[in-house]
């Protein structure tokens, strides 16, 4: 998490700031949602525990042509220590159900808010 620059400021961003900015982006997506997010695309749900940021990116990166989540994809890549490409699923990513992107974003947002309140920024 030492290389989270480029989202809002030129230098490295403290983890708390990066997490807050990610939460703000997800709030923005959910509040500005008029039509179904990403036209109802479905993605693999994830286990919101260890390795969550990489798992979230692995799931969302498969959705292309959805400008609403492009910034989220970029921001998540800053939290994931390894490069993620479409079609890549780590062992942490159990493929048991698919949900709409809108639900995925809501679930992720609720969990990140909880982490932020608890001071878990990494």
């Amino acid at each position: 998490l030492t290389c989270l620059g480029g989202f809002a400021s030129p230098g490295p961003v403290p983890p708390s700031t990066a997490l807050r900015e990610l939460i703000e982006e997800l709030v923005n997506i959910t509040q500005n949602q008029k039509a179904p997010l990403c036209n109802g695309s479905m993605v693999w749900s994830i286990n919101l525990t260890a390795g969550m940021y990489c798992a979230a990116l692995e799931s969302l990166i498969n959705v292309s042509g959805c400008s609403a989540i492009e910034k989220t994809q970029r921001m998540l890549s800053g939290f994931c220590p390894h490069k993620v490409s479409a079609g890549q699923f780590s062992s942490l990513h159990v493929r048991d159900t698919k949900i709409e992107v809108a639900q995925f974003v809501k679930d992720l947002l609720l969990h990140l808010k909880k982490l932020f309140r608890e001071g878990q920024f990494n």
Epitope: P36, C38, N39, G40, S41, V43
Partner: nanobody, 116 residues
Framework: EVHLLESGGGLVQPGGSLRLSCAAS????????MDWVRQAPGKGLEWVST????????YYADSVKGRFTISRDNSKNTLYLQMNSLRAEDTAIYYC?????????WGPGTLVTVSS
């Protein structure tokens, strides 16, 4: 352009079987992950099943596990869903989808009604 057309739906009694087909064109079918998704009357979308491009990976919603089987014939650009032991709660419009694409790329769907 992605084009998908489902067929095989109809009226069936509880405990009966149906086989849905989906003819695909406009994209490289054999390298695409494919989904079946359904929408029951007055309900939201529900993911049913996914098959990987290589046919090695098949995944099912808990509600259909052990009853439904997804398969594909890459030589025919066709996706299938074999549905056995059908229940009233399986009544829905079934859509074939190229994974990770929005509804504008889905087919029109095929209606499955399970009723006695």
């Amino acid at each position: 352009e992605v084009h998908l057309l489902e067929s095989g739906g109809g009226l069936v009694q509880p405990g009966g079987s149906l086989r849905l087909s989906c003819a695909a064109s406009g994209f490289t079918f054999d390298s695409a992950e494919m989904d079946w998704v359904r929408q029951a009357p007055g309900k939201g979308l529900e993911w049913v099943s996914t098959i990987s491009p290589s046919r090695r990976g098949t995944y099912y919603a808990d509600s259909v596990k052990g009853r439904f089987t997804i398969s594909r014939d890459n030589s025919k650009n066709t996706l299938y869903l074999q549905m056995n032991s059908l229940r009233a709660e399986d009544t829905a419009i079934y859509y074939c989808a190229k994974a990770y694409t929005g509804r504008s790329y889905w087919g029109p769907g095929t209606l499955v009604t399970v009723s006695s």
